[in-house]
């Protein structure tokens, strides 16, 4: 999906008001310096592409974050403010949620959510030059 035409300001507002708090809750008990940020993004559409991938695509060691509150809210925000945000992606998320049996917060998941926090922070500061 091409995130170019999303309403970035409204997605940013949703992140600041609620998604960010859910990410912090998920990471509670973890030091902010514990993980290095290895995933970066260059502009807002690119940031949303990376956020979508990291939030909804299973990775080795972290089967799925799709059932977490921050993920459900991310999906809702993209569905509302990204025109034509693919129904297949929405449906794929539902299938993933059904497959997931039990909630296990692994170290790999914590690292992944730490990367997500970095991507969201970058999304909120689009005018900063890439390091």
């Amino acid at each position: 999906y091409d995130f170019t035409n999303c309403d970035f300001e409204k997605i940013k507002a949703a992140y600041l008001s609620t998604i960010s708090k859910d990410l912090i809750t998920y990471m509670s008990g973890t030091k902010s310096t514990e993980f290095n940020n290895t995933v970066s993004c260059s502009n807002r559409p690119h940031c949303l592409t990376e956020i979508q991938s990291l939030t909804f695509n299973p990775t080795a060691g972290c089967a799925s974050l799709a059932k977490e509150m921050f993920a459900m809210k991310t999906k809702a925000a993209l569905a509302i403010w990204c025109p034509g945000y693919s129904e297949t992606q929405i449906n794929a998320t539902q299938a993933m949620k059904k497959r997931r049996k039990r909630k296990v917060t692994t170290n790999k998941c914590l690292e992944q959510v730490s990367q997500l926090q970095g991507l969201w922070r970058r999304f909120n500061r689009p005018l900063l030059k890439q390091q």
Epitope: A13, S17, I80, G84, E87
Partner: antibody, heavy 121, light 111 residues
Framework: QEQLVQSGDEVKKPGASVKVSCKSS????????ISWVRQAPGQGLEWMGM????????NYAEKFQGRVTITADPSTTTTSMELSSLRSEDTAVYYC??????????????WGPGTPITVSS | QSAPIQPRSVSGSPGQSVTISCTGT?????????ISWYQQHPGKAPKLMIY???KRPSGVSDRFSGSKSGNTASLTISGLQAEDEADYYC???????????FGGGTQLTIV
């Protein structure tokens, strides 16, 4: 069963405000969006805006921006729509409608019975 | 953005088929597969008949079907029955500002 129950008929004077409520029952309130749609006498349907309880955000049609406010009380699973600066053209039946599940907010699979609002001096 | 265009009225005999068209633009109907159809009897709330172009909610008869070609969506009702007499509205997702646009409505008369 799943239903939306709306508040009763209203008669208002031009310039006044009106608030219509919509009580949800039989489904998980936070999993859906609630939209408001109006229908003037003998006319078609018009989407006004929606509230997404999961995010606590609203989205309004440009035509109604600044004049409509949609709020929710999750404790009573009630959504309210307030329309201000009423004029005679606002005379219509106002429906609350549930946006589809699984984030498919753009179709409406459950409707309230409608609340007639008459604006007359 | 203006409302998608529907014929004001269509008619058919019991057992026949009718098709109601809904013509929009590339910014709404042509741009997304987010088209719904609603049936409304006089004095009643609308009822969802078709969503996402051609999907039927549970409980809706398979006599109702939807399709889309370019900027035009269509609702076909086969084997017309007396209770099908009602107003029919198409609706389309129309981007993040307008969000949903309803067509002007079509009155179906069973003759």
């Amino acid at each position: 069963q799943e239903q939306l129950v709306q508040s009763g008929d209203e008669v208002k004077k031009p310039g006044a405000s009106v608030k219509v409520s919509c009580k949800s029952s039989g489904f998980t309130f936070g999993s859906y969006a609630i939209s408001w749609v109006r229908q003037a006498p003998g006319q078609g349907l018009e989407w006004m805006g929606m509230l997404v309880p999961l995010l606590g955000v609203t989205n309004y049609a440009e035509k109604f921006q600044g004049r409509v406010t949609i709020t929710a009380d999750p404790s009573t699973t009630t959504t309210s729509m307030e329309l201000s600066s009423l004029r005679s053209e606002d005379t219509a039946v106002y429906y609350c409608a549930r946006g589809g599940s699984n984030y498919l907010y753009w179709y409406f699979d459950l409707w309230g019975p409608g609340t007639p609002i008459t604006v007359s001096s | 953005q203006s409302a998608p265009i529907q014929p004001r009225s269509v008619s058919g005999s019991p057992g026949q088929s009718v098709t109601i068209s809904c013509t929009g633009t590339s910014s709404d109907i042509g741009g997304y597969n987010r088209i719904s159809w609603y049936q409304q009897h006089p004095g009643k709330a609308p009822k969802l008949m078709i969503y996402d172009v051609s999907k039927r909610p549970s409980g809706v008869s398979d006599r109702f079907s939807g399709s889309k070609s370019g900027n035009t969506a269509s609702l076909t009702i086969s084997g017309l029955q007396a209770e099908d007499e009602a107003d029919y509205y198409c609706s389309s997702y129309a981007g993040t500002d307008t969000f949903v646009l309803f067509g002007g409505g079509t009155q179906l008369t069973i003759v």
